[in-house]
């Protein structure tokens, strides 16, 4: 679809005569009839196949024609066509004399003709005007013409329809050749596909408008490249949605069971060494000078009776000092100036000479110790009881009195509430400091997983279009992870499909 435009510029009829040679009375009141038709090598009688148009009376005899496109569009003359422009044409321009006001063909005789011209040839669609001048015996006509496409038509033949739009069916303007030029932020054959935020994950993200990144179920983050872990996952991560892969030191379905109490809570004080000994249990190995379950108690250095041979111990800021009895010397009064001749061994200890009599050693009877058998044996000195157990001397032996929750000779064993398998229906048992907790499998609840609640939410295959179904164990619901190209809680809606166009 396009328009053949003809701009009449000047008509000269100096003698004011008709084609017959007769003069017009009083002058030739001139109007024009224009006929546009298919190309004819020789213009012959026949219809104006591309259209006709007439002007009002434009002047008398000789006159210039005003460009009247602003005020009603009479000049240039418009010859619209609604077909593919063939590139060739025949144009006939007739000048007629109008004796009266009635310009209808049937109101004028054929000999009211002043003159006529015919041109034929090739004409390409374009904005440039072609200027021409035709002279006959008595008249001269100057005019220009061109062919342009109608609004929304493009291409060499005005055959490509393109209407700019910015709606659901497309977001584009039209190039001079009729091809679409997408508006910023849009792509695709009909510019219907938004260009998502740069970096938005191709599979896990989508958008309904440019520079947006909406996440599909199971994904999060600005670029939808972070998976959403299982609901309730405490100390875990995921590589695909709804996973809960525990961080180091954590266990259980929700990664909420502390397998590394030492690292996470640092319970041992005063530089003690912490050893994990089960879920939420640990043992602190104290540095010298400290005691207690968490080595929180500072021992007096004299408590370990470091002074031998009856030496008395004095606490000092930076340690202790032994005051030795007569006949002894050394840091711990361990060196004697006595010999067996001095009968240094108490409590029935027998003396043995050493170093050719320069020294001696006492061999103590049971229940006595010390370099001179001067000390009654305290079997609790080495603090053998673990986990805060209390050591008790019982004559020649010792025993540990354990704190609740611990057992064994040295209170080294944790009494497990889970040992009797209290969780029903395959529930997982978790020992707590003051009791236990059951984590129930899907379909069961209650303190001991004894109550049947629901079936697997994914069992009914609720997801469409080959989506992956995940059961949310905490809510007994399902979540569909959609494949690319589908959205909706069940992945039931396709996205971004181009519509059919009517043209």
């Amino acid at each position: 679809s396009g328009v053949f435009q003809l701009q009449l510029q000047e008509f000269i009829n100096e003698r004011g005569v008709l084609a017959s040679g007769r003069p017009c009375e009083p002058g030739c009141r001139t109007f024009f009839r224009v006929c546009l038709k298919h190309f004819q090598a020789v213009v012959s009688p026949g219809p104006c196949t591309f259209g006709t148009v007439s002007t009002p009376v434009l002047g008398t005899n000789s006159f210039a024609v005003r460009d009247d496109s602003s005020g009603g569009g009479r000049n240039p003359l418009q010859l619209p066509f609604n077909f593919t422009w063939p590139g060739t044409f025949s144009l006939i321009i007739e000048a007629w004399h109008a004796p009266g006001d009635d310009l209808r063909p049937e109101a004028l005789p054929p000999d009211a003709l002043i003159s006529k011209i015919a041109i034929q040839g090739s004409l390409a669609v374009g904005q440039n005007w072609l200027l021409d001048e035709q002279t006959s015996t008595l008249t001269r006509l100057r005019y220009s013409y061109r062919v342009i496409c109608s609004d929304n038509y493009y291409g060499d033949n005005c055959s490509r329809l393109c209407k700019k739009r910015n709606d659901h069916f497309g977001h584009y303007v039209c190039q001079p050749d009729g091809n679409l030029s997408c508006l910023p932020g849009w792509t695709g054959e009909y510019c219907q596909q938004p260009i998502c935020l740069s970096g938005c994950h191709e599979q896990n993200g989508y958008c309904s408008k440019p520079a947006e990144c909406l996440c599909r179920p199971g994904w999060q983050g600005r670029l939808c490249n972070e998976c959403i872990p299982h609901n309730g996952c405490r100390h875990g991560t995921c590589s695909t949605p709804w996973q809960c892969t525990c961080d180091e030191g954590w266990g259980g379905l929700f990664c909420d069971q502390d397998l590394n109490y030492c690292t996470h809570h640092s319970p041992c004080k005063n530089g003690a060494t912490c050893s994990n000994s089960g879920q939420r249990s640990y043992t602190c190995t104290c540095r010298p000078g400290y005691t207690g379950v968490d080595c929180e108690l500072e021992l007096s250095e004299c408590d370990s009776n470091p002074c031998r041979n009856g030496g008395s111990c004095k606490d000092q800021e930076d340690g202790y000092h032994c005051l030795c009895p007569p006949g002894y010397y050394g840091l711990h009064c361990e060196h004697s100036t006595l010999s067996c001749a001095d009968s240094p061994c108490f409590n029935g200890g027998s003396c043995r000479e050493r170093n050719q009599g320069a020294n001696y050693a006492c061999e103590c009877p049971p229940n006595f110790t010390g370099s001179n058998c001067e000390k009654k044996v305290d079997r609790c000195t080495s603090n053998p009881c673990a986990n805060g157990g209390q050591c008790l001397n019982r004559g020649p032996s010792r025993m540990c009195r354990c704190r609740p929750g611990f057992t064994g000779t040295y209170c080294e064993l944790h009494v497990s509430d889970c040992a009797r398998n209290p969780c029903a229906h395959g529930g997982t048992c978790h020992d707590l400091e003051n009791g236990l907790m059951c984590t129930c499998p899907a379909g069961f609840s209650g303190r001991r997983c004894e109550v049947r609640t629901s079936i697997d939410a994914c069992a009914s295959s609720p997801c469409f279009n080959r989506a992956t179904c995940y059961t949310d164990l905490s809510t007994d619901t399902f979540v569909c992870n959609c494949p690319y190209g589908f959205v909706g809680s069940r992945c039931e809606f396709p996205v971004g499909l181009p519509p059919s166009f009517p043209w």
């Epitope: 084609a19 006929c35 009688p45 006709t52 006939i92 049937e106």
Partner: antibody
Framework: EVQLVQSGAEVKKPGASVKVSCKAS????????ISWVRQAPGQGLEWMGW????????NYAQKLQGRVTMTTETSTTTAYMELRSLRSDDTAVYYC?????????????????WGQGTTVTVSS | DIVMTQSPDSLAVSLGERATINCKSS????????????LAWYQQKPGQPPKLLIY???TRKSGVPDRFSGSGSGTDFTLTISSLQAEDVAVYYC?????????FGQGTKVDIK
Amino acid sequence: EVQLVQSGAEVKKPGASVKVSCKASGYTFNIYGISWVRQAPGQGLEWMGWISAYNGNTNYAQKLQGRVTMTTETSTTTAYMELRSLRSDDTAVYYCARDSDWGTPYHYYGMDVWGQGTTVTVSS
Amino acid sequence: DIVMTQSPDSLAVSLGERATINCKSSQNILYTSNNKNYLAWYQQKPGQPPKLLIYWAFTRKSGVPDRFSGSGSGTDFTLTISSLQAEDVAVYYCQQYYNTPRTFGQGTKVDIK
């Protein structure tokens, strides 16, 4: 009175040429066209071609292309039709008729005025 | 080229009776710009040139008796002689002048029965 007067009968040998004239009067000659029509004995009407008296544009029937020439003489308001390489099947009555000229087709009335006809006989 | 086909080829009608001749064109000869059909009807009596009766398919040329009428549009046309007279015995031709080459129908001979 509008009339067309044609030249007289012709007898020609095969291979010869004939030129028939048609003198127009009573109207403005150069704003119309002239069509030539022939009628073989006992047959219907056959259009031969058309000429514009305005500028001499011509349009010939396909079967006569190359053998026929139509001309006009504005000063004498006369049209001519010449047919060359005559054959026996060219024997016919040849008519000129006033016709529309090229242009906007608002004054097309058909062939409203006819000449009396010129008999051309082609015989060896 | 536009082909014109007349029917019947010949027709015998009693004096005072109606005669109807049909003409069909191979393509549309209605010009939509002025809503006119470019069809003429001619009458040819023996030894005479054809005479224009009707143009624009139904406009009678001045001087033609009103018993002659034309009708039709597009591709199908009719010439009707409402009350046949003795002087109407002739051959009748339809012709399109929509385009060149001009083309005639083969003619319909009208006689008195």
